[in-house]
């Protein structure tokens, strides 16, 4: 806590700029006004203030604010964003992307820490759900954002936003995760036709039960090899040899290459000998 | 760089308990989800549990109801504890971090032998 002194004469501050580097921490505090500070927030990132003084300015916007930031001074926060702890963001109601993403800017290339975790929750709160353009701003700066959150939290997620996930969003999901999503996978691109569908759905296909994928080996989408391995082994076990022949198309010659690994070791061992064999590539059950 | 250490692995006789332990070091992601997979020889990796940041927990239907997976946030470690062991759990344990930035760290693993 600075001590109140009174500014020492003609050093009152009539404008946020490069001079008040030079001030000590007491005339920071004794100089500034705070409603000065928060008209002008969008100046203080281009001037190098110390930790010291930035924790001045923060104590200042603090007082003037007890209950919580406006929109308007949090948008411009800056750097002064890392400053902030869990407790202050939960005192704020942050409703605009823009605001979200210039404060995500500031954490670009870090890992994830409390503050921006907080802020995230908040804005997701304050607009009800997950929706398209949020989950396409957090994956933009978090890849694995996704991923990280829990099978509960994913049951939250609209079918809607799922359009705005890439493949490589879904790297380094699990198949309790998938199993979440697939489904609202299905309902979101359910109006696409065959081929532009499989395109959206590959992704999730790590959580599509056995009925989907028999329906998909009705629609020649010819399934590469590296996504039928990350089927789930209790979907792909019940599907006939005719049924995979569909679903891979003539990419079911890679089955060889993989037939020690699962899914594919597992269900060679549910077919019939005389079945396998009328895919010619001495697959032994 | 994420650094993941398991530990905790043996030889146990069917029916008995371990628990393994993983701890995080160099990385502090709020967002962290810890997973443990494991691979017996001569077949691939598998999925058993993982531990999300808000606490919940999911299972493989081959574990679920023998094997409980926790954290300790505070040590940054995350346990498997391993109930009714059968031969079949048999296989090299690693675990798996992964955070918000979307890259996934793996441990060297750690041996857990079942014999009946």
């Known amino acids: 806590e600075v001590e109140k002194t009174a500014c020492p004469s003609g050093k009152k501050a009539r404008e946020i700029d490069e001079s008040l580097i030079f001030y000590k921490k007491w005339e920071l505090e004794a100089c500034v006004d705070a409603a000065l500070l928060a008209t002008q927030m969008d100046r203080v990132n281009a001037i190098p203030f110390t930790y010291e003084q930035l924790d001045v300015l923060k104590h200042k916007l603090d007082e003037l604010y007890p209950q919580g930031y406006p929109e308007s001074v949090i948008q411009h926060l800056g750097y002064l964003f890392l400053k902030m702890s869990p407790e202050d963001i939960r005192k704020w109601n942050v409703t605009s992307l823009e605001t979200l993403k210039a404060l995500l800017e500031v954490n670009k290339g870090h890992e994830m820490s409390p503050q921006v975790a907080t802020l995230i929750d908040r804005f997701v709160k304050g607009r009800g759900q997950l929706d398209k353009d949020t989950l396409d701003t957090l994956t933009a700066f978090y890849p694995g954002y996704l991923c990280s959150l829990s099978p509960e939290e994913l049951s939250s997620v609209p079918p809607s936003s799922i359009w705005a996930v890439r493949p490589q969003d879904l790297d380094t999901c699990d198949p309790r995760q998938l199993d979440v999503l697939y489904p609202k996978a299905r309902l979101a691109f359910q109006n696409m036709n065959g081929s532009e569908y499989f395109v959206k759905i590959q992704s999730f296909l790590g959580g599509a039960p056995t009925e989907d994928l028999k329906a998909l080996s009705q629609q020649n989408v010819s399934m590469d090899l590296a996504t039928f391995m990350k089927l789930r082994t209790d979907a792909v076990l019940p599907l006939t040899v005719a049924e995979v022949q569909k679903l891979l198309g003539p990419h079911v010659e890679g089955l060889k290459a993989e037939e020690r690994h699962r899914p594919v070791r597992d269900w060679i061992l549910r077919q019939r000998q005389d079945d396998l064999d009328t895919l010619g590539l001495g697959l032994q059950g | 760089q994420m650094q993941l250490v398991e530990s905790g692995g043996g030889s146990v006789q069917a029916g008995g308990s371990l628990r393994l332990s993983c701890t995080v070091s160099?990385?502090?992601?709020?967002?962290?989800?810890l997973r443990w997979y494991r691979q017996a020889l001569g077949k691939e990796r598998e999925f058993i549990s993982a531990?999300?940041?808000?606490?919940?927990?999911s299972y493989s239907d081959s574990v679920k109801g023998r094997f409980t997976i926790s954290r300790d946030n505070a040590k940054n470690t995350a346990y498997l504890q391993m109930n009714s062991l059968k031969s079949e759990d048999t296989a090299m344990y690693y675990c798996?971090?992964?955070?918000?930035?979307?890259?996934?760290?793996w441990g060297q693993g750690t041996q857990v032998t079942v014999s009946s």
């Open positions: 798996k971090a992964t955070g918000s930035g979307g890259v996934a760290y």
């Open positions: 160099g990385y502090t992601d709020y967002r962290l989800v």
């Open positions: 531990i999300y940041s808000d606490g919940v927990t």
